[in-house]
């Protein structure tokens, strides 16, 4: 029950996270004009990964796509790539995890297959979350660098005079959405990986009847191998030898007339 809950919660958390990553990628407010020195501005500039927008004092907003690829900074291209990779991996992960859910029965799918699928989707979610966090962090670093560069440019002009005020940019809402979404996807992925361990089938001992050979004190149990999935502790498939004549479930078998051949 706890495994199903962990898996289900991991799926839901990852789903919310991936939806957030998609939202952040599409949002226009990755960088917003810094209004620290001029809180009542007639023009407000902000940019996303795909277009640049201007909101004017009358309320009119104009957005313009980046119609150039070569003119864009390499960092911006890298961020775009990271976010898209994150979305693609997350989407595939969601698809895999739907079939891996314990509460959903598909044909005669074994628990070991579900466990493997849960682990796969968990890893995909972790990588997806890391891609989103990395993408947002790279963009944030680019903003911080440019912010201090433009601040320096503002006050170092010809003869120390203040130049035309350069627009400075600060963190937009999309960055925070991206960080949170990436974190959620990462947590969801970890939960799926934890659930995978619990989904693995338990090791089972096959019951066997022991036969006494005359004059021997050790009974050999045919088929006395422990079946293992590889997830449990008995991975060496040791043969089980027993000193007494007992069945697997420790019930004493007494000598009968058929014991001696």
């Amino acid at each position: 029950m706890a495994v199903t809950a962990c898996q289900g919660l991991g799926f839901v958390v990852s789903l919310i996270g991936i939806a957030g990553i998609i939202a952040a990628t599409c949002m226009d407010q990755w960088s917003t004009q810094d209004l620290y020195n001029n809180p009542v501005t007639a023009v407000f500039n902000y940019q996303g990964l795909w277009r640049s927008c201007v909101r004017e004092s009358s309320g009119f907003t104009e957005c313009r796509g980046y119609f150039t690829l070569l003119g864009l900074p390499a960092m911006l291209q890298a961020v775009r790539a990271l976010m898209i990779v994150g979305i693609v991996l997350g989407a595939i992960g969601l698809l895999v995890s739907i079939f891996a859910l314990k509460c959903i029965r598909i044909g005669s799918m074994e628990d070991s297959a579900k466990a493997n699928m849960t682990l796969t989707s968990g890893i995909m979610f972790i990588v997806s979350g890391l891609c989103a966090i990395a993408g947002v962090s790279v963009f944030a670093n680019m903003l911080v660098t440019n912010f201090w560069m433009s601040t320096a440019n503002m006050y170092t002009g010809m003869g120390g005079m203040v130049q035309t005020v350069q627009t400075r940019y600060t963190f937009g809402a999309a960055l925070f959405v991206g960080w949170v979404a990436g974190g959620l996807t990462l947590i969801g992925g970890v939960m799926m990986c934890i659930a995978c361990r619990g989904l693995a089938p338990e090791e089972t001992n096959y019951k066997a009847v022991s036969y006494h050979a005359s004059g021997h004190s050790v009974a050999y149990k045919p088929g006395g191998f422990k079946a293992s999935t590889g997830f449990g502790s008995n991975t060496k498939n040791k043969k089980i030898y027993d000193g007494g004549a007992r069945t697997e479930d420790e019930v004493q078998s007494y000598p009968s007339k058929h014991d001696y051949v």
């Epitope: 023009v43 009119f60 104009e62 150039t68 864009l72």
Partner: nanobody, 123 residues
Framework: AVQLVESGGDLVQAGGSLRLSCAAS????????MGWYRQAPGNQRELVAM???????NYADSVKGRFTLFRENNKNTVHLQMNSLKPEDTGVYYC?????????????????WGQGTHVTVSS
Amino acid sequence: AVQLVESGGDLVQAGGSLRLSCAASGSIFGFVVMGWYRQAPGNQRELVAMLTSSGTTNYADSVKGRFTLFRENNKNTVHLQMNSLKPEDTGVYYCRAVIRSDSSWRADANEYWGQGTHVTVSS
């Protein structure tokens, strides 16, 4: 830098017509809005008409049906055609433009104002 140059201001009789022009020059990579504001003596500066990049035009209620704002084809110039002028239309008319004047990928927009042109409507 961007410069806005207004022209067309004059003294005119009530009921007459006048055309104001505003030409933008400099590093222009597209305009966001372009329009006219006026300031009557002792009053605040108010919007007269505004043209957006999407093609919509907004007018002040007091000038609707009398004034027409339009942009010259493929030019960074807007004209304000003023008909049926009234004495209350008197004032200094300022051209205002929000222009993308940054060549970088960000294409920052800034606000620019002209020096103003005087319009006097006598009764």
